[in-house]
Amino acid sequence: KKVVLGKKGDTVELTCTASQKKSIQFHWKNSNQIKILGNQGSFLTKGPSKLNDRADSRRSLWDQGNFPLIIKNLKIEDSDTYICEVEDQKEEVQLLVFGLTANSDTHLLQGQSLTLTLESPPGSSPSVQCRSPRGKNIQGGKTLSVSQLELQDSGTWTCTVLQNQKKVEFKIDIVVLAFQKASSIVYKKEGEQVEFSFPLAFTVEKLTGSGELWWQAERASSSKSWITFDLKNKEVSVKRVTQDPKLQMGKKLPLHLTLPQALPQYAGSGNLTLALEAKTGKLHQEVNLVVMRATQLQKNLTCEVWGPTSPKLMLSLKLENKEAKVSKREKAVWVLNPEAGMWQCLLSDSGQVLLESNIKVLPTWSTPVQP
């Protein structure tokens, strides 16, 4: 017998062909011999089956000897053997209806798990293979699970259900809710204004939730909240802001914070946490602030950086247009009795300058000038 696979919610057309290319009497029945539909002349007649309101045929094809059974809005329980009786012949078609659904919601937080559940008729033994938007293949039986969803898992998942050498394809759109970047680092000279931005990697019509920037300053023994806020339909309202530092926050997305000035006591690491309405769990983005200060005290020219720097970063002091006088993988460097001129303090990574601060050293009878 012929096997046809269908998708829950879809429409299927089961074919039945007579040898005579004309309209003759036909009947479609289920395995319990209950009539589904047939014809009486040019009229469609329906039987007492549970498919009554969802079953149909194509009258326009009857004259060509084609008597299809169309079942709309397929249900798993429609899986059955359907019999077409025409010209004293019986054509049997086995219909197997499958459904594939995501665990709860198709909008999931980064790091959460995606579970795809296959609904299948009793007695079937399908196999499922899904391909993620980034090309990762996962296989399974009735359930498939992907733990620790990543941003690249956003998009259309294509799942193929295989049964009796026939296949049916499902497409499920998954949105991974996340920040565009997991981590960012800002390099600033002391006194400069600092801008922190937290762009989201998804767009939804209404975005409501709440959040907090929790900060661990390098110099502080404990971490603390710098700002808390609410988000209503993409509008940001500040709930509470610490008095030192007094951060400012943009009223619109993307989430944007301004620190009036970079100071050594603020250098450190922060974690912006965002809780979204109707979601358990939170989105996180790490942000780091590195602050540089160049000073001259009496006969000592010093350059210091505070904040989370990697051990491979190089801190140098050099007189403009000259070779570096001192260059170390440390957070402070100094030159004793610096000669007069414009000195540069450079923080660099493999030759790329990340941060630069200039300080003018005057002849010994004068005081230094910060440009």
Partner: antibody
């Protein structure tokens, strides 16, 4: 180590006054909002008031407004609750707490001071 | 004022049991919810902040979930030291308000 120690509790007659103090140590007191929370005998917790870092912003629950007033002295690392026109319903253990937890949670609490209003 | 309603008001359980306490807010409070544990004669102790964040030093058998108006505190495997009263508290708007408490007793 963060420590909060309440003092000043005791027995007071209805209509009387009392001033509770909370001595803070082990953290930068002037950097945190602080709260008072009370618990009547055998009852649940009731938030009373809170105050911002420099004392310029204060919030009180309606049932105590005009009678109980929160204040602080950052130079002394101390939080206060001035209690006037006391009533029987004010009988409770009063806890001072630091609003230093993430998402505005009360992360450290004192051991409490018992205030009994009775004639 | 936002009303916080906890259920059940008391629960009898045995060591090793899984216990869930629910807290419902009279209006949406996003994730501005904390859970506290209090033992007789002691100050409350913070367990969960922001509806689901585990406070440092708190055992991982405690977990929080929910957002908006419905929240749950779950103790996955009850230990002898967990018999206490548990309170939820909203920090969405003043005045902060607590639930009436749930007493976890030994069966």
């Amino acid at each position: 180590e963060v420590q909060l120690v309440e003092s000043g509790g005791g027995l007071v007659q209805p209509g009387g006054s009392l001033r509770l103090s909370c001595a803070a140590s082990g953290f930068t007191f002037s950097s945190y909002w602080m709260s008072w929370v009370r618990q009547a005998p055998g009852q649940g917790l009731e938030w009373v008031a809170n105050i911002n870092e420099d004392g310029n912003e204060k919030y009180h629950v309606d049932s105590v407004k005009g009678r109980l007033t929160i204040s602080r002295d950052n130079a002394k690392n101390s939080l206060y609750l001035q209690m006037n026109s006391l009533r029987g319903v004010d009988t409770a253990v009063y806890f001072c707490a630091r609003e230093g937890g993430q998402w505005l949670a009360l992360d450290y609490w004192g051991q409490g001071a018992l205030v009994t209003v009775s004639s | 004022d936002i009303q916080m309603t906890q259920s059940p008001s008391s629960v009898s359980a045995s060591v090793g049991d899984r216990v869930s306490i629910t807290c419902r807010a009279s209006q949406g409070i996003s994730s501005w919810l904390a859970w506290y544990q209090q033992k007789p004669g002691k100050a409350p102790k913070l367990l969960i902040y922001g509806a689901s964040g585990l406070q440092s030093g708190v055992p991982s058998r405690f977990s929080g979930s929910g957002s908006g108006t419905d929240f749950t505190l779950t103790i996955s495997s009850l230990q002898p030291e967990d018999f206490a009263t548990y309170y939820c508290q909203q920090a969405n708007s003043f005045p902060w308000t607590f639930g009436q408490g749930t007493k976890v007793e030994i069966k």
